[in-house]
Structure formats: C-alpha cells, structure tokens
C-alpha cells in the first residue's frame, strides 16, 4: 500500500492521460483524484500502465467505492478488471449485458478465471434466469459454460434459451446435465418438422428416454454412431434390434466396432442372438435361442 504524501507542485492530474505513466506510485496516489479517475475510466485502457501503477489506480477506486463500484465504472474497467478479486466482484451489481460483454472481452482467449466465474454468477443471479441473450453471450466466450453449471442451475434455463446452444457447447456435459436440458430442448424444438427437429435435438439426446428413441426410430433419422454412443444406457437397453436398425439406418454397421463398449455391449447382452444375427454384422453375446428371458423388474412391480 502506498503511503499518503502531498502531491508535488504542478503534478496534480487534470485528466487521465499518458503523462501518468511517468508518475511514481506515490505520485499517482497523491496526484490523481479518485472521482476524476472514475469518470475517465475508459481512458485507462489506452494507456500502457505498469501492473504496479494499476494497483494504485484500483486502490483509489476501492477507497472511493468501498461498497462496490457503480456499473458506470465497471463497464469501463478494461484490463483493470484483471486486478479485481472475486471478493471485489461480489460487491458489484451488474445488470447490463453490454457491461458483461466488455469484461468478458478482457479475459478473451483465456480459461474462465475465478473473477469471470464470479462475475457471471452475479449477473445471472441478478437477472433471475439464463435468458437467451445472456446464454448467447456466455457460450460465445466460453463454449463449455453450459456444462459447468449444476443440474439445479440448469433448471433455471428457459426453453427459449436453448435456441442459442450449439453442439460444441454440450461437449463436456454429463448425463445428469443432459437429463435437465433434453426436455427443454424437446419443448423448444417441438414445432419443427422431422429432419430439422433431429438436427437440432441430436446434441441433447444423451438425456432422451426410451420412448423418445423409439419414436425417432420411426422417422428415418439415420443417427450416427457417435450420437448413439452418448445415449443413456438405460434408455437404449429396451430398444429392439429392429428399432436400433431403423434408428441408425446405414450407420448400423458401426455397431460391430463398438460391440465391447457401452451402451452397445449392454444392449447386445439383452437381445436374442437370432435377432442380432439378422443384422449380418457378426455381433456375439446375445441370449441363446431357446432361453427364457425374465424381466425381474417387472416381476417385482407385479408382486
């Protein structure tokens, strides 16, 4: 921290300009008025201050706004944002998407920092939900953003926002997250026709239940193996050989290469071997002919 000393004669800053890079830290502290700095924050970005000088400028703003900076200052922080701690940011009330964009721009190309995570959290909580514009913005800067949210947080995403989601935004989502997102996507895309619907819903299918997969198998969708391998195992197991064949279309041949991996492996174990043989792929491990299959879960339900 810089000790308090009087500003030398003639050095009082009348505006925020490049002459300030020649000031020592104590001179910045003594000669730059915090209120002037606050009103001319947008100029700081154009001046190549040292990190040590930026520390002094931040200290001046902290003294002026001990309860947290107003949005008019936050929007123009520029690279001074990188000096903020999560504790600083928790004091802010950021409501403008433009402010959010300006600060995300500063961190562009870097991993999501604790500061950015805190900023986004404050912004989304302030809005009450993840609306489409916000989601658009966040996934543009951080494609993995959606998958960083808990299922509880994802539940606040309105179906209308799902239109902003791109396939790559879901790459790192786990099944629990897709379980939450799939019904929203189904609702969002419900008025689309068959082929268009499948293109949009495909990325979310890791959360689809069996009955929806059965319905898709009737629509000539030709699901690729990569999508099939991401489906919930419990949703795939009840599908018949005929349904899987219809679901995959020409891609059904890819099952052979995946026969030892879930969900294909577990699905094969549930099928009659003679049904599997009809595919002509040489899939092995099905239930031998003549064996009786008891569905114990059904039996328990009846008793």
């Amino acid at each position: 921290e810089v000790e308090k000393t009087a500003c030398p004669s003639g050095k009082k800053a009348r505006e925020i300009d490049e002459s300030l890079i020649f000031y020592k830290k104590w001179e910045l502290e003594a000669c730059v008025d915090a209120a002037l700095l606050a009103t001319q924050m947008d100029r700081v970005n154009a001046i190549p201050f040292t990190y040590e000088q930026l520390d002094v400028l931040k200290h001046k703003l902290d003294e002026l706004y001990p309860q947290g900076y107003p949005e008019s200052v936050i929007q123009h922080l520029g690279y001074l944002f990188l000096k903020m701690s999560p504790e600083d940011i928790r004091k802010w009330n950021v409501t403008s998407l433009e402010t959010l964009k300006a600060l995300l721009e500063v961190n562009k190309g870097h991993e999501m920092s604790p500061q950015v995570a805190t900023l986004i959290d404050r912004f989304v909580k302030g809005r009450g939900q993840l609306d489409k514009d916000t989601l658009d913005t966040l996934t543009a800067f951080y494609p993995g953003y959606l998958c960083s949210l808990s299922p509880e947080e994802l539940s606040s995403v309105p179906p209308s926002s799902i239109w902003a989601v791109r396939p790559q935004d879901l790459d790192t989502c786990d099944p629990r997250q897709l379980d939450v997102l799939y019904p929203k996507a189904r609702l969002a895309f419900q008025n689309m026709n068959g082929s268009e619907y499948f293109v949009k819903i495909q990325s979310f299918l890791g959360g689809a239940p069996t009955e929806d997969l059965k319905a898709l198998s009737q629509q000539n969708v030709s699901m690729d193996l990569a999508t099939f391998m991401k489906l919930r195992t419990d949703a795939v197991l009840p599908l018949t050989v005929a349904e899987v064949q219809k679901l995959l279309g020409p891609h059904v041949e890819g099952l052979k290469a995946e026969e030892r991996h879930r969900p294909v492996r577990d699905w094969i174990l549930r099928q009659r071997q003679d049904d599997l043989d009809t595919l002509g792929l040489g899939l092995q491990g099905g239930i031998p002919n003549g064996y009786l299959v008891l569905d114990l879960s059904m039996q328990e339900a009846l008793s």
Epitope: N45, P48, T50, G78, Y79, F81, V106
Partner: nanobody, 118 residues
Amino acid sequence: LQLVESGGGLVQPGGFLRLSCAASGFTLDYYAIGWFRQAPGKEREGVSYISSSGGSTNYADSVKGRFTISRDNAKNTVYLQMNSLKPEDTGVYSCAAAGGYGNSSRYWGQGTSVTVSS
C-alpha cells in the same frame, strides 16, 4: 502473441543505443506503446510513450531532449533512440502495448538490458 525487445548492451557514458520493440502474432497499429525501465532495487518507471497513430509522444523529464520514440507500423516495431547516455540510464528496458477503448488486450515484453558504464 508477444512483444520482443532488442538492442540493449554495454555502452560508455555519452554513447547511444537504439532499442527495438517488435510485436509477434499481432499488429501494433492499434496500440499505444510505452517504454519503461527498472534499475536494480528500484521501482519500474515510465520513460517514453507514443500513441497508436504516432502523432503524440511524451517523455519522462529525466530523458527529455536525449531520447526519441518512433514507430514503423509497416515493420510492426517501435523504436527508442537513446543519445547522450548517462550511468543513471542503466536498467532493464521493456515495452508495453495498450489497446485503447474497446480493445482490452495489453502486452508486455521481457525486456533488454542497458548498462552505461566506463
């Protein structure tokens, strides 16, 4: 994306050096550049400044009349011509680039060492 300084070395008092600050991976055109120096055990201090257009320059009082900053955007490089060097000019000289409003990128070089001694 980085700034690379060069041109430092050992020089006698009264001598001269020309330092270069070259950008690699990005274009310097839109950036204001500052030259700074840090002597051992001392605070880093600003030496010179040039605006993105090159139309505005500024200097620390201690180097006015001796140092000249210039830029060649075609070569993506900023120069610091240092004449009449004094022992107190000794230090590590580094350049910094700041992008201005709507461009929050900023870059620092690693520095080049200047020693003025007889």
